[in-house]
């Protein structure tokens, strides 16, 4: 639509030219032509000209009824035919919207990603409004009640610099338009709660030449946290289903995970920690795909595993790839066997 | 020390206008801070009507049954922020006060000395 | 959020120690403020954060609480502590709903 109009007359519209969707709208148009007397005025929506619920109200001005508008965006203008003249004369044009007052934010998540400085929040913003939404996080100290508001769109990075004052804070959200307001739920923060350590990598993995093969996966992260709990997942690529394996790890050097696996198979690990006793976990990490040797000799595969010395394992579980995990985008990466010689799977960064 | 002096109280007809001031000193206007108002009839208790939030935007906040009516808004340049009346009633007449901590909390440790507004005919 | 204090009036002699509650209609941790009012001055901040003494405010009088319900006490009435006390939250004022943030008030005078 145009937004600046040279009008001669005026249009305007009952509710107002923002309104909810689904509403009837009245769109009236009133001329004010010099040397016009108009036999006719005429509207049109998105340029095209309308045919019905056109009321003349007076000789100067009429009115387009919709019932139940629905379209989200739609420039209306209104023209009068003149006597004596062979185009229509323009009065006035509008932009009009219609959409939704906005769902209170749900979902509110704040983590601090190690290393990076910011605390990152994130929500759900609901059904869509259609109109112009601007969401402003609130972040409020518990010690001092100093408060500090950031304008946002979908998510939200807060410089740690700023967060200086205290450790304990509320944090909302509050999402606003033309035709509402709604807060989220208050969100709880302490920040030396809601770090999630440094990316956890697979960096290579190798396949023993022993009686009985084992696939030790070696492993690594950046993160200064001492205590930090791991889980690992793999499954052969023609698998539906995950194990999982649980460690204790301390990073302060790579880590090192055995596994008694199916021969002559494909793996994909991926690994993802947390914390030791906070809530907020890192996303898995990329696929790293392995390729097991050749059987040697015949015997009935178990697929289990051990732990590396230095790790502390709790428990195996199965989990499907329909599980409460999150979903994963699944690049299943070549691996190669060069002589007979372990593989080392590629992975991803 | 903050200080905070209001002005524009008066007699007013009802359904007419009125805009308010509140002059501020000693707030650093380049930090955030709320600027609140709150009125108080006659023989009533305070009545909250609104804040506004300077920080890297401004936002406003309303009583809801101020919204509509009130109106907040605040000249920098000036170090003043206003309380806009429209359509004003007889139960509208009270003393109305600005009031802030000169930072970004919701509790009050400076008030101005009160205006009043009288709406009647 | 609605804060509900009570009493509305309270009578009591010098020396007495006084207590005025305030409630608020759901969770607001311990974001409130009590101030004292005398006729035809503006209020006075004596308490926020439910329990921190505003600066100059004689020791007399503390707060407490937190969540949805709030104390003001006055350990020994002077004189000067007869007026009004109002309690408000400090929480958040973004609700679309709110209606006051102020308690109704509590007007304390002299017995007798």
């Known amino acids: 639509g145009i937004t600046s109009i040279n009008c001669s007359g005026d249009m305007w519209v009952e509710p107002g030219e923002i309104f909810q969707m689904g509403m009837n709208v009245s769109i009236y148009c009133q001329e004010a032509l010099k040397h016009c007397r108009p036999r006719n005025l005429y509207f049109y929506k998105n340029g095209f000209k309308e045919e019905f619920d056109i009321t003349r109200i007076n000789r100067t001005t009429a009115r387009i009824w919709y019932k139940g508008f629905s379209e989200p965006h739609a420039y209306m203008h209104c023209t009068a035919e003149c006597p004596g003249h062979f185009q229509e004369t323009l009065i006035c044009g509008k932009d009009i919207s219609s959409g939704h007052p906005p769902d209170a934010p749900s979902n509110l998540t704040c983590v601090i990603y190690e290393y990076s400085g910011n605390m990152t929040c994130t929500w759900n913003t609901g059904k869509p409004t259609y109109i112009d939404t601007k969401y402003i996080v609130h972040v409020k100290s518990l010690e001092t009640e100093e408060e500090q508001q950031y304008l946002a769109s979908s998510y939200v990075k807060i410089s740690t610099d700023s967060l200086q004052g205290s450790r304990k804070y509320l944090v909302w959200v509050q999402a606003v338009n033309s035709l509402g307001m709604e807060n989220s739920q208050q969100l709880h923060v302490h920040l030396d709660d809601i770090v999630i350590p440094s990316a956890s990598i697979i960096s290579r993995a190798e396949t023993t030449n022993d009686t009985v093969p084992k696939t030790i996966v070696y492993w690594k992260s950046k993160t200064m946290i001492e205590k930090v709990f791991c889980e690992m997942r793999y499954k052969t690529t023609t698998n539906q289903t995950w194990s999982v394996k649980e460690f204790d790890a301390n990073f302060t050097y790579v880590q090192q995970s055995e596994f008694y696996l199916e021969p002559d198979s494909k793996y994909v690990f991926q690994v993802r920690c947390q914390e030791t006793g906070k809530r907020n976990w890192q996303p898995w990490s990329s696929p790293f795909v392995h390729q097991t040797s050749q059987e040697t000799g015949k015997r009935n595969w178990q697929p289990w595993s051990s732990p590396f010395v230095h790790q502390t394992s709790q428990t195996v579980s199965q989990v499907t790839a329909k599980s409460s995990h999150e979903p994963q985008k699944m690049e299943m990466l070549s691996a190669t066997i060069f002589r007979g010689h372990p593989a080392s799977g590629n992975h991803q960064d | 020390e903050v200080q905070l002096v209001e002005s524009g109280g008066g007699l007013v007809q009802p359904g007419g206008s009125l805009r308010l001031s509140c002059a501020a000193s000693g707030i650093d206007f380049n930090s955030n801070y709320y600027m609140c108002w709150v009125r108080q009839a006659p023989g009533k208790g305070l009545e909250w009507i609104g804040c506004?939030?300077?920080?890297?935007?401004?936002?406003?906040y309303y009583a809801n049954w101020a919204k509509g009516r009130f109106t907040i808004s605040r000249d920098n340049s000036k170090n003043t922020v206003y309380l806009q009346m429209n359509s004003l009633r007889a139960e509208d007449t009270a003393v109305y006060y600005c009031a802030t901590s000169g930072s970004s909390v919701l509790y009050f440790k400076f008030w101005g000395q009160g205006t009043l507004v009288t709406v009647s005919s | 959020i609605q804060m509900t204090q009570s009493p509305s009036s309270l009578s009591a002699s010098v020396g007495d120690r006084v207590t005025i509650t305030c409630q608020a209609s759901?969770?607001?941790?311990?974001?409130l403020a009590w101030y004292q009012q005398k006729p035809g001055k503006a209020p006075k901040l004596l308490i926020y954060s439910a329990s921190k003494l505003a600066a100059g405010v004689p020791s007399r009088f503390s707060g407490s609480g937190s969540g949805t319900d709030f104390t003001l006490t006055i350990s020994s009435l002077q004189p000067e502590d007869f007026a009004t006390y109002y309690c408000q939250q400090t929480n958040r004022y973004s609700n679309p709903d709110i209606y006051n943030v102020f308690g109704q008030g509590t007007k304390l005078t002299v017995l007798g």
């Open positions: 506004i939030y300077v920080g890297s935007h401004v936002n406003t």
């Open positions: 759901e969770n607001i941790y311990s974001f």
